[in-house]
């Protein structure tokens, strides 16, 4: 499958359309604080450079990989040392470690801008002016603000904002139509950046094993009525597509993806039964619909797991001979049975039964000692099960703002060193999963809360490795990919935390909080909430309470009243002395 | 600086009653929130009650329903009325308001 020129076969199989995204979206997800306009220049150059290499593979330079002529580039930027600091030096390094440089640098938290919506008229107007250009800094918006956003997904949400400005910006009442399908653009698109963004750490940060592992438990659970070899070969050509996007080689990863859509479409009928409507549709819809596809029906007459993997003289046999493709197939065959388990669960059950093996094989009557092994299962099993079952009662008690209040204030207490900002942003997140997943009948409440709490959890392991503050957030984080949960919610209140000196400042409040949205006054209520128990870390539910009570109320009389910045300087010293008082402080 | 001033401390048998009074100088308590903490030999303060700036009253889970708190405007005074008083409720119990804490007032409770 060796070209002469990579880039001209990358460019033929994309189109050019594809290909220049492709690359707006690989340099801005490197170059995050680039303007859009030097971007642009950029890949028209490196398009116009590909174009040659089409018409004469061997012109000069065609045969260099991509991240030779990406890398190079890149490093014609000016503003580079100044901009970016120290990735500058990336530019003094040969292939592959300059391109390993510039993924080491790629920022979860950018310092850039607030993305505003302007009014519905000047982006319909922008739109219609030019098309194309407002399109791409859609792409660039997004991408230099994701740098691991799945970057043919990516494709796939500028394919649906493309259609809703050409539909809604025709329409009688544009914003109507508009805004609504902005909104679920924008969730979508944060959804699924994150959920990216914990198959690129589990590739980086625990290593293809720990993704394929994911990757058999997740299929197996998809496509319960394919083969184990059907699923294997997946398994592999998924892995392949995620380490290319992870790893910055875009192209490729587009290419390869498109190519599993096609083998899976092609291979429908030892696959899944519920595929065809995926298949028929486009290239970008088709893989986004495969990625997405519920789960098949289980085959009715599947045997019981133990005659294999616990009653069979051979376990310790079959084990010895291939230990990875064994456990694959428990994982596989476990993974099947039970759509109703989260894929950590069912990774945390396929460790342990590893870890029996390896000790039972080496004893003096193996079977003797993993006979049992089932029977570990259920405390493992049980563990989340019970706390979903918790908390979905207190989110039906509380309702979603009031619950992720209570999150707040519970992952303040285990991690205070965290940045406000981050535990507001995680907290409000984990507090989602209520109106996500606890509307979901027994069977699927499991797979819905926990395996998004994963990705919620790794937003703040990402956010936090960027400025390690709390050894406790680094022991949950590196630990083990599939006990993050588990070792956050185990965590106590830190005993060891010096509470913050008491600041008035950080609860001075203005009148511009009375234009700002309910959600952003949410998160104004959720940032003093965090600070009340930075400096108060053993106050108790009832004077947070009685605080917020009394910061609501202020805000209400202070936005109602006829002069608001002196209601809020007067009233403001009295709010702060009556939560000193509350608190105790 | 505003003056607060606790009083009705003492010691009272368990089951028996007390009302404790925190005089606050040079501010009013209406419209400004106040609390009441106490702190048990060798233990850390704890919460106790708190009148919110819109009269709201939170107490502890502790003394929910045997602790009553009240307010007396011609006098600016602030009242904390314990019944059903338990040996645990053995502590000095401090008025504060105003960014301003009283220097407690003793409160024992004998078996």
């Known amino acids: 499958d060796a070209h002469k020129s990579e880039v001209a076969h990358r460019f033929k199989d994309l189109g050019e359309e594809n290909f220049k995204a492709l690359v707006l979206i690989a340099f801005a997800q490197y170059l995050q604080q680039c303007p859009f306009e030097d971007h642009v220049k950029l890949v028209n150059e490196v398009t116009e450079f590909a174009k040659t290499c089409v018409a004469d593979e061997s012109a000069e330079n065609c045969d260099k990989s991509l991240h030779t002529l990406f890398g190079d580039k890149l490093c014609t930027v000016a503003t580079l040392r100044e901009t970016y600091g120290e990735m500058a030096d990336c530019c003094a390094k040969q292939e592959p470690e300059r391109n390993e440089c510039f993924l080491q640098h790629k920022d979860d938290n950018p310092n850039l801008p607030r993305l505003v919506r302007p009014e519905v008229d000047v982006m319909c107007t922008a739109f219609h002016d030019n098309e194309e250009t407002f399109l791409k800094k859609y792409l660039y918006e997004i991408a230099r603000r994701h740098p691991y956003f799945y970057a043919p997904e990516l494709l796939f949400f500028a394919k649906r904002y493309k259609a809703a400005f050409t539909e809604c910006c025709q329409a009688a009442d544009k914003a109507a139509c508009l805004l609504p399908k902005l909104d679920e653009l924008r969730d979508e698109g944060k959804a699924s950046s994150a959920k990216q963004r914990l198959k690129c750490a589990s590739l980086q940060k625990f290593g293809e094993r720990a993704f394929k592992a994911w990757a058999v438990a997740r299929l197996s659970q998809r496509f319960p009525k394919a083969e184990f070899a059907e699923v294997s070969k997946l398994v592999t050509d998924l892995t392949k597509v995620h380490t290319e996007c992870c790893h910055g080689d875009l192209l490729e990863c587009a290419d390869d993806r498109a190519d599993l859509a096609k083998y899976i479409c092609e291979n429908q009928d030892s696959i899944s039964s519920k595929l065809k409507e995926c298949c028929e549709k486009p290239l970008l819809e088709k893989s986004h619909c495969i990625a997405e596809v519920e789960n098949d029906e289980m085959p009715a007459d599947l045997p019981s797991l133990a005659a294999d993997f616990v009653e069979s003289k051979d376990v310790c046999k079959n084990y010895a001979e291939a230990k990875d493709v064994f456990l694959g197939m428990f994982l596989y065959e476990y993974a099947r049975r039970h759509p109703d388990y989260s894929v950590v669960l069912l990774l945390r059950l396929a460790k342990t039964y590893e870890t029996t093996l390896e000790k039972c094989c080496a004893a003096a009557d193996p079977h003797e000692c993993y006979a049992k092994v089932f029977d570990e299962f259920k405390p493992l099993v049980e563990e989340p099960q019970n706390l979903i079952k918790q908390n979905c009662e207190l989110f039906e008690q509380l309702g979603e703002y009031k619950f992720q209040n209570a999150l707040l204030v519970r992952y303040t207490k285990k991690v205070p060193q965290v940045s406000t900002p981050t535990l507001v942003e995680v907290s409000r997140n984990l507090g989602k999963v209520g109106s996500k997943c606890c509307k979901h009948p027994e069977a699927k409440r499991m797979p819905c809360a926990e395996d998004y709490l994963s990705v919620v959890l790794n937003q703040l392991c990402v956010l936090h490795e960027k400025t390690p503050v709390s050894d406790r957030v680094t022991k949950c984080c590196t630990e083990s990919l599939v006990n993050r949960r588990p070792c956050f919610s185990a965590l106590e209140v830190d005993e060891t935390y010096v509470p913050k000196e008491f600041n008035a400042e950080t609860f001075t409040f203005h009148a511009d909080i009375c234009t700002l949205s309910e959600k952003e006054r949410q998160i104004k209520k959720q940032t003093a909430l965090v600070e009340l128990v930075k400096h108060k870390p053993k106050a108790t539910k009832e004077q947070l309470k009685a605080v917020m009570d009394d910061f609501a109320a202020f805000v209400e009389k202070c936005c109602k009243a006829d002069d608001k910045e002196t209601c809020f300087a007067e009233e403001g010293k009295k709010l702060v002395a009556a939560s000193q008082a509350a608190l105790g402080l | 600086q505003v003056q607060l001033v606790e009083s009705g401390g003492g010691l009272v048998q368990a089951g028996g009653t007390l009302r404790l009074s925190c005089t606050a100088s040079g501010s009013t308590f209406r419209g400004n929130g106040m609390a009441w903490h106490r702190q048990a030999p060798g233990k850390e303060r704890e919460f106790v009650a708190y009148?919110?700036?819109?009269?709201?009253?939170t107490y502890a889970e502790s003394v929910k329903g045997r602790f009553t708190l009240s307010r007396d405007d011609a006098k600016n005074r602030v009242y904390l009325h314990m019944n059903n008083l338990e040996v645990e409720d053995t502590a000095v119990y401090y008025c504060?308001?105003?960014?301003?804490w009283g220097q407690g007032t003793q409160v024992t409770v004998s078996s």
């Open positions: 009148m919110g700036m819109t009269d709201r009253i």
């Open positions: 504060t308001a105003f960014g301003s």
